[in-house]
């Protein structure tokens, strides 16, 4: 009975995600056969999150909308380790929107998920951000500094990175 109800719960949870994620890749968490963590196929996983590189070229607003219709947000980067994981899947000649913007152009940067902006955990290229008209953040590669963040005009089409919490079933 316990196993049956657990299976029913899992199936209903999977149905929630089916519209945008017809296929999930799941791994067993720890030693307990009951606990599985999943990411949509072909998203990648790191710690408790799933990541998707969107190769369509869109403005920041539309990139965020694109992530949201998949149940995600533009990526919020919380640690150096997380950034190091993300960049493994990026192309050096492309730029990617992050979930970081300065809507008022007053250098009050904010993350899409309301995570407090912490100046000590930022990875701006040197000299960036540097323009009040450039109110959205991208991650890109500079040969001198490797990967880092840059401010850019929000309407310039870019690729983007989506992030969502792992699905636990």
């Amino acid at each position: 009975n316990f196993m049956y109800s657990k299976t029913v719960k899992r199936l209903s949870k999977l149905r929630e995600y089916q519209q945008y994620h017809p296929s999930l890749t799941c791994v067993m968490e720890g030693k307990d056969i009951e606990d599985w963590s999943c990411c949509p196929t072909p998203w990648t996983s790191f710690q408790s999150s799933c990541y998707f590189i969107s190769t369509g070229m869109q403005s920041w607003t539309k990139s965020q909308k694109n992530c949201s219709v998949m149940g995600a947000d533009l990526v919020v980067i919380n640690t150096r380790e997380e950034q190091d994981f993300i960049i493994q899947n990026l192309k050096r000649n492309s730029s990617y929107f992050l979930g970081l913007s300065d809507p008022g152009g007053r250098r009050h940067w904010q993350w899409v998920d309301q995570t407090p902006y912490n100046e000590n955990v930022t990875f701006w290229h040197s000299g960036e951000p540097n323009n009040l008209d450039e109110r959205c953040a991208i991650i890109n590669f500079r040969s001198s500094e490797e990967w880092g963040w840059n401010d850019i005009h929000c309407h310039v089409p870019q690729k983007s990175i989506c992030k969502m919490k792992k699905i636990y079933i």
């Epitope: 369509g56 869109q58 539309k62 694109n66 008209d133 309407h155 310039v156």
Partner: antibody, heavy 118, light 107 residues
Framework: QVQLVQSGAEVKKPGASVKVSCKAS????????IHWVRQAPGQGLEWMGT????????SYNQKFKGRVTMTRDTSTSTVYMELSSLRSEDTAVYYC???????????WGQGTLVTVSS | DIQMTQSPSSLSASVGDRVTITCRAS??????LAWYQQKPGKAPKLLLY???TLAEGVPSRFSGSGSGTDYTLTISSLQPEDFATYYC?????????FGGGTKVEIK
């Protein structure tokens, strides 16, 4: 008031290049993207690409990649669209358009007719 | 790339008629759609954006609706100055493609 004034008509031979200019006035030039759209005689509209005048970032329609180059001169508030390796099918009116705050084309230039003929 | 299919390609109507033009996208464009009016020898003029928001100075007889992949431009009572060609354009992702156009002619 916002104005986009384009350069005059051009006649070019196949294989040549053309450079069309679009001079902006009435707003802060570096704050808005400029897009280029073309229209062949009696045909529909085709998006070619865009440039952000503040930093010079560009995004091109793959169809024109390698043949189109968009540049800007902030000192004269002018954007340029250069199309190379011209062929007869490139005969068209070329328009510049400003992308407004709402992310749509709110102001257009008057158009520049480019004729490619041997 | 998202393709935009506009219909009809032309129509004949009289002053006072209600006119409907449709635009179908090959994928969901999430209401990021504009409608333009173009007269011979002139640049296009923005009529509506975000599928249904009237651009500044555009008469209220123009309206837009739709969602997902299907969108409509309606002119509630056609006026003499409305005889022109109408284009839709999506702004979801590049390339920002246009529909093929609808020429509205006098019957």
């Amino acid at each position: 008031q916002v104005q986009l004034v384009q350069s005059g008509a051009e006649v070019k031979k196949p294989g040549a290049s053309v450079k069309v200019s679009c001079k902006a006035s009435g707003y802060t030039f570096t704050s808005y993207l400029i897009h280029w759209v073309r229209q062949a005689p009696g045909q529909g509209l085709e998006w070619m690409g865009t440039i952000y005048p503040g930093r010079g970032d560009t995004s091109y329609n793959q169809k024109f990649k390698g043949r189109v180059t968009m540049t800007r001169d902030t000192s004269t508030s002018t954007v340029y669209m250069e199309l190379s390796s011209l062929r007869s099918e490139d005969t068209a009116v070329y328009y510049c358009a400003r992308m407004g705050d709402n992310e749509y084309f709110d102001y257009w230039g008057q158009g520049t007719l480019v004729t490619v003929s041997s | 790339d998202i393709q935009m299919t506009q219909s009809p390609s032309s129509l004949s109507a009289s002053v006072g008629d209600r006119v409907t033009i449709t635009c179908r996208a090959s994928g969901n464009i999430h209401n990021y759609l504009a409608w333009y009016q173009q007269k011979p020898g002139k640049a296009p003029k923005l009529l509506l954006y975000d599928a249904e928001t009237l651009a500044e100075g555009v008469p209220s007889r123009f309206s837009g609706s739709g969602s997902g992949t299907d969108y409509t431009l309606t002119i509630s009572s056609l006026q003499p100055e409305d005889f022109a060609t109408y284009y839709c354009q999506h702004f979801w992702s590049t390339p920002y493609t246009f529909g093929g156009g609808t020429k509205v002619e006098i019957k």
